[in-house]
């Protein structure tokens, strides 16, 4: 059981420093921007980081979410990551969720954060170079220390 | 860096409360969890329970405790506190605060350690 | 009695390579991420290895850690003087619903 608490409004980062933005065709990509880059591409630099409180004991539970025109939430259905137009929902009656992620802060690097899935135990938010792009994708932990695992959220509000 | 600093050493009557504060510096107080681990002279650690301030003082406790532990936390001072009733000889210990920011049953984080020695 | 068995006692020599293990069972370790303490003499214990097999920052990769089944180990290699200390190994036990530690073992470098 999942049962959503309070809102924040924040920009995520990768480990190069790169911001992470839902294009026009609603993928999440990370690209270098400077900070009025940043603010410039708003709102589609600015997540909605909802938390949730857990049943069991199991971490910051969390969904991602931007507004565009509508809000669209992130998903891992299937292992695939996606970006649904849903509201994050008040409450989830279930343990595992596509949309809900554990959001933990790696010990001994208080500012570096993971998202580790709720539907898939030990897979993991990375980024991840195909072609020229840098995406957001589903990725299981498979080397110790992976830095594409490990983001940097910065509040907003 | 977060420290968690606890208060100093109590020497408690049989019978009587004891309250160990700790508090957090240099992290985000209320958005992991704090347990409680206590350590007798000589022996092993033993968890006690955790509060878990971003849960609006969501409070989880072991059974063994259950009734006689009550865990609070003040986010505006950023303490969490552990509050055991009813001493008895068998609770001198080390009572240590542990921080949780990983998962909420990785300690990442622990306080110097409070002595609270029960004796009449 | 501990949830978790821990043998009281390892040593080793300098430059060996010590294991410590830590056995449970299904309720526990076997559903269950393992964890592992070092505690020095005199001080708070302090966060080894987390989720069988991670290092938190600052901590050498001498000490490994990993799990089979319902048991779980904690490897070190090149031992040195230095890593003279209690050890305690702990997971989540459903049975209970609450955290569970091991009842420590006492490393000693010979």
């Known amino acids: 059981y999942f049962g959503k608490l309070e809102s924040k409004l924040s920009v995520i980062r990768n480990l190069n420093d790169q911001v992470l933005f839902i294009d026009q065709g609603n993928r999440p990509l990370f690209e270098d921007m400077t900070d009025s880059d940043c603010r410039d591409n708003a709102p589609r630099t600015i997540f909605i980081i909802s938390m949730y409180k857990d049943s069991q004991p199991r971490g910051m539970a969390v969904t991602i979410s931007v507004k565009c025109e509508k809000i669209s939430t992130l998903s891992c259905e299937n292992k695939i990551i996606s970006f649904k137009e849903m509201n994050p929902p008040d409450n989830i009656k279930d343990t595992k969720s596509d949309i809900i992620f554990f959001q933990r802060s790696v010990p001994g690097h208080d500012n570096k954060m993971q998202f580790e899935s709720s539907s898939y135990e030990g897979y993991f938010l990375a980024c991840e170079k195909e072609r020229d792009l840098f995406k957001l994708i589903l990725k299981k932990e498979d080397e110790l220390g992976d830095r594409s695992i490990m983001f940097t959220v910065q509040n907003e509000d | 860096e977060v420290q968690l600093v606890q208060s100093g050493a109590e020497v408690k009557k049989p019978g009587s409360s004891v309250k160990v504060s700790c508090k957090a510096s240099?992290?985000?107080?209320?958005?992991?969890?704090i347990s409680w681990v206590r350590q007798a002279p000589g022996q092993g650690l033993e968890w006690m329970g955790w509060?878990?301030?971003?849960?609006?003082?969501?409070?989880f406790y072991a059974q063994k405790f259950q009734g006689r532990v009550t865990i609070t936390a003040d986010e505006s001072t950023s303490t969490a506190y552990m509050e055991l009733s009813s001493l008895r000889s068998e609770d001198t210990a080390v009572y240590y605060c542990?921080?949780?920011?990983?998962?909420?049953?990785?300690?990442?984080?622990w306080g110097q350690g409070t002595l609270v020695t029960v004796s009449s | 009695q501990s949830v978790l068995t821990q043998p009281p006692s390892a040593s080793g020599t300098p430059g060996q390579r010590v294991t410590i293990s830590c056995s449970g069972s299904?309720?526990?370790?076997?559903?269950?991420?393992v964890n592992w303490y070092q505690q020095l003499p005199g001080t708070a214990p302090k966060l080894l290895i987390y989720?069988?097999?991670h290092r938190p920052s600052g901590v050498p990769d001498r000490f490994s850690g990993s799990k089979s089944g319902t048991s779980a180990s904690l490897a070190i290699s090149g031992l040195q003087s230095e890593d003279e200390a209690d050890y305690y190994c702990?997971?989540?036990?459903?049975?209970?619903?609450?955290?569970?530690f091991g009842g420590g073992t006492k490393l000693t470098v010979l």
């Open positions: 542990a921080r949780a920011a990983y998962h909420p049953l990785v300690f990442d984080n």
């Open positions: 240099g992290g985000t107080f209320n958005s992991y969890a």
């Open positions: 509060i878990n301030p971003f849960y609006i003082g969501e409070t």
């Open positions: 299904s309720s526990n370790i076997g559903n269950h991420y």
């Open positions: 989720r069988n097999n």
């Open positions: 702990q997971s989540w036990d459903y049975s209970g619903f609450s955290t569970v």
